[in-house]
């Protein structure tokens, strides 16, 4: 099988920051990886050159060169390998069990920890891990998480041509190498393809002691997904609904927060929340949908569906969602704005994801939104 | 969970043509490279050839070229095979495969010359 | 074209031992830098062909642990540490390092 994500994904844990362009004293080390990637695309040419994610990998490798006007010939580099801080006691052997499990280990040294939540769903919306709710236009490629245990990276793409509503179409995780317990893994779904298994085919860790520590298990063949970093006390589900992805997490905020460079790294999605520029305003959008005649242009999409009007979408997403929070809010712009009746199950789902993986039950239903950065 | 079907097989007199379909579904054809191999009856496998995800490669084993070609339909998930000048040796069950090197094959599909 | 050769024709083999079976090439199958891309197959009565192990060595998804590759440059090896029913059939090797992709002519895998 073709191993491209391989590359991938050594590439993005060599560049660290992922998607955002290296500062000006970065990009010799940039360039090294940048070579690192294209010898190691060369050497799937074999078992990969007929597929798209190669042939998108070689393009994408030949732009960031010549935008950083890298040259072919240099250096290369090794996959950065950080230090990551202990889960447990610096005291512990790396050897023991203790040190793959999480809470076992924090509560040598602290109390419960506290968990927090994220998710990310329909058109999209982030549910951040302070409990911001926005919606996004995140067109493209971006991180939702790139801490110094795992990233998360999302590719969001149109929802109908033209508009600047986009859902999630590809979900790439990538679970960092760690002490004794996980060697690097790599999960990634795509729009019809969500695996039960890591890219290398494997269900957990590795080789390692603690290999167990990650588990992958399918709920619901090709539509429902679960991760369990133990580890790392972490949870995340991945959904198929309708032809796009849903991500939710439960991660521990020590983990949220163990990232080396706040300047560059701490800018992910779910702790920052999307920036300024896009996000759209959809409280606005909804007082124009309730409007009697609704313009245009209060619609992020040029093209409205005319398939359901406002009155459709707030009987079928009440059908689902009975409380009126932000997630019922944002089932009826994703009706309005698609008009793709699966976007009703999306935000049900990120609700029910929410119950499953948020420590305070109270803050679950949000009625606020806030679209200033945390 | 991925699934190829193929169909368009059954009894043809050398020198004839047939063109073989292989329905994809569990996964996103348009991304990948896709493979043709056959199986004469009681014999071992043969690759026929290959084609890349966007059409723009093709591959073919020299017992084939220029007699059979590769296309596909990425809008229905479809993968075909079109056999000209049959010859007798050519008598096998055809099996498409996902891939640039196969991973996941189809049941295949028992293609038969004969006069 | 690269021509793989598998020994043996046959294997027969009680239910919990080992099997073990080569496959040599024509030529080096080693590519860029230690990879090789030598696959081996297993077709079971009646079916279509399974991939079991890719990359020499590489086990693909689902494939239990008993199955284990090895070898490098032009010989290769494909054990079975116990061998269960559902393993009888016929182990195809296949290379991709070079064009044309060619496959072994088998060893076919027996229950005693």
């Known amino acids: 099988p073709c191993k491209i994500l391989k590359c991938n994904s050594e590439f993005w844990s060599a560049t660290s920051s992922g998607s955002h362009a290296p500062a000006s004293d970065d990009v010799p080390e940039f360039c090294a990886a940048l070579r690192t990637y294209a010898l190691c695309t060369r050497r799937t040419a074999r078992t990969c050159r007929g597929d798209l994610a190669y042939h998108s990998a070689v393009h994408g490798i030949e732009d960031l060169m010549s935008q950083h006007n890298c040259s072919k010939d240099g250096p290369t580099s090794q996959p950065r390998v950080r230090t990551l801080p202990p889960a447990g006691d610096s005291q512990e052997r790396s050897d023991s069990p203790e040190i793959c499990h999480y809470e076992k280990s924090f509560h040598k040294h602290s109390a419960a920890p506290n968990y927090t939540h994220c998710g990310l769903f329909g058109d999209p919306h982030l549910r951040t891990f302070t409990d911001h709710f926005q919606t996004c236009k995140v067109q493209g490629a971006w991180p939702l998480i790139d801490n110094n245990y795992l990233n998360v990276q999302v590719t969001n793409t149109p929802v109908l041509p033209g508009s600047a509503a986009t859902a999630t179409s590809k979900l790439t995780i990538i679970f960092k190498n760690f002490q004794e317990c996980v060697d690097q893994k790599v999960y990634q779904a795509e729009m019809d393809e969500l695996p039960s298994a890591f890219a290398d085919g494997s269900k957990n860790g590795g080789d390692k002691h603690g290999a167990n520590s990650l588990k992958i298990t399918e709920k619901v063949s090709g539509q429902h997904v679960e991760i369990q970093a133990k580890y790392i006390g972490t949870t995340i589900v991945v959904r198929q609904v309708g032809r796009y992805l849903t991500f939710a997490v439960r991660m521990p905020e020590e983990v949220v927060n163990a990232v080396e460079d706040r300047d560059s790294q701490g800018l992910y999605l779910c702790l920052r929340g999307c920036p300024l520029n896009q996000q759209i305003d959809f409280q606005a959008f909804r007082a124009n949908a309730e409007s009697p005649r609704r313009p245009a242009a209060a619609s992020p999409s040029p093209v409205v569906p005319e398939t359901f009007p406002y009155e459709t979408a707030v009987a079928k997403c009440k059908e689902k969602l009975p409380v009126e929070d932000l997630y019922y809010q944002a089932c009826v712009f994703d009706l309005l704005t698609t008009g793709d009746v699966n976007f009703t199950l999306a935000a049900y789902y990120a609700l029910e994801d929410g119950k499953m993986l948020h420590s305070n039950k109270d803050k679950l239903h949000l009625f606020e939104r806030t679209r200033e950065l945390p | 969970e991925v699934q190829l079907v193929e169909s368009g097989g059954g009894l043809v007199q050398p020198g004839s043509s047939l063109k073989l379909s292989c329905v994809a579904s569990?996964?996103?054809?348009?991304?990948?490279?896709m493979n043709w191999i056959r199986q004469a009856p009681k014999k071992g496998l043969e690759w026929i050839g290959m084609i890349y995800y966007d059409s723009s490669e093709k591959h073919y084993a020299d017992s084939v070229k220029g007699r059979f070609t590769i296309s596909r339909d990425n809008s229905k998930n479809t993968l075909y095979l079109e056999m000209n000048s049959l010859r007798s040796e050519d008598t096998a069950i055809y099996y498409c495969?996902?891939?640039?090197?196969?991973?996941?094959w189809g049941q295949g599909v028992m293609v038969t010359v004969s006069s | 074209d690269v021509v793989l050769t598998q020994t043996p024709v046959s294997l027969s083999v009680t239910l919990g031992d080992q099997a073990s079976m080569s496959c040599r090439s024509s030529?080096?199958?080693?590519?860029?830098?230690?990879?090789?891309?030598l696959e081996w197959f297993l077709q079971k009565p009646g079916q279509s062909p399974q991939l079991l192990i890719y990359e020499v060595s590489n086990r693909f998804s689902g494939v239990p642990d008993r199955f284990i590759g090895s070898g490098s440059g032009t010989d290769f090896t494909l054990k079975i540490s116990r061998v269960e029913p559902e393993d009888l059939g016929v182990y195809y090797c296949f290379q991709a390092t070079h064009d044309p992709l060619t496959f072994g002519s088998g060893t076919k895998l027996e229950i005693k």
């Open positions: 495969a996902k891939g640039t090197t196969p991973d996941y």
């Open positions: 030529q080096s199958l080693e590519y860029s830098d230690g990879y090789t891309f």
């Open positions: 569990g996964f996103t054809f348009s991304n990948y490279g």
